[in-house]
Interface confidence: low
């Protein structure tokens, strides 16, 4: 049978031939009667065999990392007969490892992010090197990690490659670190090979800085004409943190927040000072407010960095603007009696220049032929007034500064024309009626009412009477109903159409005004032949009968 030991050849041997071992048959008595042959991949090129002895040699340098074993076949032949002495056999040549590969970091580039101010021992990242040498061959692939660059802030666990923080770091001093890790094989013993990798460690921000104002005093100006909501300037704090941790909110300390406000522009992180209430140079020409700034997001555990908010003082100067005249009242209402003579006093309006120079004021009334106004603001009538034509006047008064005629103010003026009793009451309509020839005494023939164009402070009250002539010699009488109406009654029995076809009665109507006014009104009464049944037959004034709807034969 075949006799051999296990075959090993060290990799990277520089010799041109290296004896590996011997293949032999136990039938071989050493008299060179057998021939040995080598077959398979590498036979003749990488490995050769001494045909007589069976000694195997490697004639090329081998690389275990390229190929770690070779499977070959051996034959032994009897030279005399040409027959195989032993059956063909397969055998293995193993390439033994030497430490010819340095550790390599395959996952480069390494980059890690860790919060600033992280405590010692915080895990940052794990780096892993691989070594192509044989892990089962001694310590050739057993690695030890060490830190070449990165002390005193970082450390590396020698066997795992885990990088940890060994000293607190402040992102605001330095925001990234290059750590260089070395991996050595042979667990660092002499003859070890090494590989290095760089790890970029970036510090992420934590909110460990409060915002601080750039200036302790800001000077701003605002025009007194500025409307509320006007931005009058910006203030700025800076925060060494970044991103969300540098977002800030500006505010005004409570006592100072009546006239101004501060809103935060979250894009620029500026504080915009806003006018909250209109200012008046003549009332107050400067303001002082205290503003404070705080971070928008502060986790509870970082509140120790934010105990006292940064403050700044803002001095705001109010700029004077030439303002239009200011009336004492927003509108004026005056009363004047009708029928007062031209030039009568109506009232006085007053406007002043709110500015410090106190320009004299000129007044005018727009589109009015009825009233005048002088430079003192005194309003008088320029025509007689009749309440019954116009009881109210809606006018506009304009005040203009003498030194700057562009500065104008206008306000409404309402003038009420008060009533005087200048109209007597009169019939509310034209009255024309009839009486039958056969009418009896005390018969009601007409109810009358009156109207008065005057305005009554109380209710109108009218008094009805017959004129003196009619009272003394009248076929009719009148009764005042005490409700601004009266009734006309016959004062006799029977009337004669032929003798007296029509009566004209003068009725006096007086009002309750002071002084009282009285008018005389005529009531026309026609005499008609009414027949026995009382239906109208004939009146001399035929049209009346028709218009009243009475039947005619």
């Amino acid at each position: 049978g075949w006799v051999w030991n296990q075959f090993f050849v060290p990799e990277e041997m520089n010799t041109t031939s290296h004896h590996i071992g011997q293949l032999r048959s136990d039938l071989d008595n050493g008299n060179n009667s057998f021939q040995y042959k080598l077959l398979g991949a590498g036979a003749g090129s990488t490995f050769i065999i001494d045909e007589r002895t069976g000694d195997i040699y490697a004639i090329q340098k081998l690389d275990r990392e390229e190929r770690s074993l070779y499977i070959l076949r051996a034959q032994v032949i009897d030279i005399a007969t040409g027959r195989a002495v032993e059956p063909e056999s397969e055998f293995v040549i193993k390439v033994s490892d030497i430490n010819d590969n340095e550790p390599k970091f395959l996952d480069e580039p390494y980059e890690a992010i860790v919060p600033e101010m992280s405590p010692e021992g915080t895990l940052v990242i794990q780096v892993t090197a691989s070594d192509a040498d044989d892990p089962s061959s001694g310590n050739n692939a057993r690695l030890l990690y060490s830190l070449l660059q990165g002390q005193p802030y970082f450390s590396v666990e020698p066997t795992t490659g885990v990088i940890r923080i060994s000293s607190k770091m402040d992102r605001e001093l330095q925001d990234e670190y290059w750590v260089i890790i070395q991996a050595k094989d042979m667990i660092g013993q002499p003859g070890a090979l090494s590989g290095t990798t760089s790890v970029l460690i970036k510090l992420s921000d934590v909110n460990d800085n409060k915002p601080i104002f750039k200036e302790s005093l800001y000077r701003l100006t605002v025009s007194e004409s500025a409307p509320t909501g006007t931005s009058i300037g910006t203030i700025m704090a800076y925060d060494n943190d970044i991103g969300e941790n540098a977002e800030m909110d500006y505010s005004i300390e409570e006592d100072d927040s009546q006239t101004f406000d501060i809103i935060t522009n979250h894009e620029t992180q500026e504080g915009i000072v806003i006018l909250k209430k209109k200012v008046d140079f003549e009332h107050q020409n400067h303001y002082g407010i205290r503003a404070k700034v705080k971070n928008h997001h502060v986790p509870e555990q970082l509140m120790k960095y934010h105990t006292e908010a940064s403050t700044t003082f803002i001095k705001i100067q109010v700029e004077d603007v030439d303002e239009p005249p200011l009336f004492l009242l927003p509108y004026y209402v005056f009363e004047v009696f009708e029928e007062t003579p031209q030039g009568s006093f109506v009232g006085v309006v007053s406007a002043t220049d709110p500015d410090n120079r106190k320009s004299p004021i000129r007044y005018s009334i727009t589109r009015s032929k009825v009233f005048n106004i002088n430079d003192n603001g005194t309003i008088t009538t320029s025509n007689s007034l009749d309440r019954e034509i116009s009881a109210w006047y809606n006018l506009s008064i304009t005040a203009t500064e003498k030194y700057n005629i562009e500065q104008i103010s206008s306000i409404p003026l309402y003038v009420q024309v008060l009533n005087i009793n200048d109209h007597a009451p009169e019939f509310s309509q034209y009255y024309e009626t009839y009486v039958c020839e056969n009418a009896g005494s005390g018969q009601v023939i007409q109810t009358i009412s009156a109207v008065d164009r005057d305005e009554s402070i109380e209710e109108h009250h009218f008094y009805f009477n017959l004129s003196v002539e009619d009272t003394n010699n009248s076929s009719f009488t009148i009764i005042d109903n005490q409700d601004n109406t009266a009734v006309i009654l016959t004062n006799r029995t029977g009337f004669n159409l032929q003798e007296e076809p029509v009566f004209y009665i003068s009725i006096l109507i007086a009002d309750n005004g002071i002084p009282s006014l009285t008018s005389t009104n005529t009531l026309t009464i026609h005499v008609c032949d009414c027949g026995d049944s009382g239906s109208t037959q004939t009146c001399q004034y035929q049209e009346l009968v028709l218009s009243m709807g009475f039947k005619t034969e």
């Epitope: 830190l147 070449l148 660059q149 990165g150 002390q151 005193p152 802030y153 001093l173 330095q174 290059w178 260089i180 090494s194 290095t196 760089s198």
Partner: antibody
Amino acid sequence: QVQLVQSGAEVKKPGASVKVSCKASRYTFTSYYMSWVRQAPGQGLEWMGIIHPSGGDTTYAQKFQGRVTMTGDTSTSTVYMELSSLRSEDTAVYYCARGGIKLWLHFDYWGQGTLVTVSS
Amino acid sequence: QSVLTQPPSASGTPGQRVTISCSGSRSNIGSNFVNWYQQLPGTAPKLLIYTNNQRPSGVPDRFSGSKSGTSASLAISGLQSEDEADYYCAVWDDSLNGWVFGGGTKLTVL
């Protein structure tokens, strides 16, 4: 910008000692190593040694062992290099340079240099 | 005699590309990062390339570094007159436990 400002030029007799200072500013002094490098007239650069200012750890080039002493003063952010037993061949411009072993594998900032002349 | 070997001089015309070599051993260049320094006449050296091929901010991208085995090189493309200076390679040597510099290369722009 980091600044390293060195002391002024010195003239010394052979056998004497010289102490050169290097004041650092605009960075955290205790976080960085400081090396000393010299350059003889018309010659190349020669590394002398390194110090970590916070702990005072030093590593000296074999050539200068026993003759050079490097110290640091954290209160003034200053490092010092003292070279004793001066010889004429020590005539050179001496530079402090931030960086070196372990912490930074390069010298990123240099002082302006101090000329030391050794002459009898 | 420097541990790192550099050519004493190099030259080129404006716009040209020049390369400066730096040869060492396994204990220095073979194991560690290479740095390059530029020293303009009468001034302190200035860091030009660090960790083999990184440029500090402010150094033009005309300057590039590379390392292979136990050698390193500095390449300058688009040569300019202001590049005329001494160039030094430097590396930590594990055997000597210290920094070693090349002898320096004087670059002349013709």
